[in-house]
Interface confidence: medium
Amino acid sequence: DAHKSEVAHRFKDLGEENFKALVLIAFAQYLQQCPFEDHVKLVNEVTEFAKTCVADESAENCDKSLHTLFGDKLCTVATLRETYGEMADCCAKQEPERNECFLQHKDDNPNLPRLVRPEVDVMCTAFHDNEETFLKKYLYEIARRHPYFYAPELLFFAKRYKAAFTECCQAADKAACLLPKLDELRDEGKASSAKQRLKCASLQKFGERAFKAWAVARLSQRFPKAEFAEVSKLVTDLTKVHTECCHGDLLECADDRADLAKYICENQDSISSKLKECCEKPLLEKSHCIAEVENDEMPADLPSLAADFVESKDVCKNYAEAKDVFLGMFLYEYARRHPDYSVVLLLRLAKTYETTLEKCCAAADPHECYAKVFDEFKPLVEEPQNLIKQNCELFEQLGEYKFQNALLVRYTKKVPQVSTPTLVEVSRNLGKVGSKCCKHPEAKRMPCAEDYLSVVLNQLCVLHEKTPVSDRVTKCCTESLVNRRPCFSALEVDETYVPKEFNAETFTFHADICTLSEKERQIKKQTALVELVKHKPKATKEQLKAVMDDFAAFVEKCCKADDKETCFAEEGKKLVAASQAALGL
């Protein structure tokens, strides 16, 4: 629909509260270093302008595009060049180049201080004193640290954040009520951010076709009773929503997501029997619920795939006449029959099928050529199955922390050039696959594990892209989206790596480690482990284990000492010397 004023249209559709929240998210995701107060001022100015357009759509500038309006507003920031450097050059460009320029300057790892959680009473006082500002600050802090966070979903998180404070600040034991809820929101938020980052990377680096293929596979698993035409419609709409959000068009994205949820609920009879409860919820909860809904049961008596995709005389005709539709149907049919496969495996199978048809449909006897195509799938299916089996056995044997350490060593040896914080962050997340997925029965393990690993490896890819240091990482990240995990799995120890010079400072610890949380202490130890491997990439598991055990004992001993700082200084020197001897440094 053509609207005289796009800004008025979105303001009316979304309502003032959501409009302001989404504009704040958009601005914070673009200008990640700007102070909160500056953003609030800009948002208020945009909101007042939107209201004039609602009153009169023909008013001056109301016909301008949202990119033009928002871009003009961002470019009024006085300190743009001092704070952002070359990003200020974006303001010399015209739309749509200006918006593209802003997008390219989004920083996945902004240099921002870690969010420190204040005391519960301090937070509750701030919440009661000015609830609106408190919640805006939450949106701002999350959005600037996660510039690709799925904006309509962030509104859902903010709603839960508000509910937590509303309930817990009245509770007898505020901390016992509030802290677990905040921990849950933090962990879910990080996971949500990482999942959305993969969607945006898929669209931006590999194109719409790659995203649509992913969506066909996932939605077909989730809605196996829906017909292909229905799945195709949902995929088209979902692609539009994510393209908009990944492109910074957050108002359009939120509006279209609401429309999609409405459509799904109005047509749930032809989509899935699992949607009933979701569709009874308010909008934000409804959209979240649909996105997380369990797979519907597979229809009974689905015919063999071979009839249409191998045995039929018309395979090459179907393929030639409408390649992507035919491959989409193959993916749909395969995925709805295999909720036990990961989406990336399904996409590998579809790619193998496509490659075979490309070759065989040009052959003298096409049918003879592609007759055994399904046999080629067997090794592709067995590879992730075996890998997951081995790693779950290792996880069950070691527990999460030691499993993470095994992965830290494995990945540091594969790509030792990657920065230590990135290796620690990524390996810790890779290690979480154990507690997340190994508890599941066989039928749910692969979709849980391999699709989660895709999300985590994408974190490595986007962080590495900012400052590329390893050709091997670049290769695995850019060659094929669906083969990233097999590519990293196949990497052996990097024999070309020149070990890092030994620096005693890296292994010098102080009494402050004693007051850290268990998680922070683990990170310190894991940071030391990565540095050890970088110094001695040929060290055996046994050598590294011995050094890490000594290190754990050293920390425990000194944290119990009366004069902790002296203990860390003296015992630390001995530990470094012993470690050097043990590793032959």
């Epitope: 017909e227 249409d308 039929s312 179907n318 006449e321 409408a322 149907m329």
Partner: nanobody, 126 residues
Framework: EVQLLESGGGLVQPGGSLRLSCAAS????????VAWFRQAPGKGREFVAG????????YYADSVKGRFTISRDNSKNTLYLQMNSLRPEDTAVYYC???????????????????WGQGTLVTVSS
Amino acid sequence: EVQLLESGGGLVQPGGSLRLSCAASGRYIDETAVAWFRQAPGKGREFVAGIGGGVDITYYADSVKGRFTISRDNSKNTLYLQMNSLRPEDTAVYYCAARPGRPLITSQVADLYPYWGQGTLVTVSS
């Protein structure tokens, strides 16, 4: 659910023409793979022609290629089979069949079509 109702059958002389119609209800015909099958007395069902949904790809059995044309009118939600140069061996009951959910693929295997009409008799005889 898809309901299908054929019409247009009858007696025709060899070399003559007939146009069969199949009116669909319960679903848009352009979203569905649809086909014509026939069954001669004492024989199994045989694929005659088919058309994909979404993308208009047509398929014909070798025995009718060049003589029969399958088409559809989406506004009327109706499938047609134009039969020219009819032969005595074309005598059979002609059935319309629909296969929702597979817009593109028109299979020649009767078992893969869940929805069928009642059939209309075509007799080619002098």
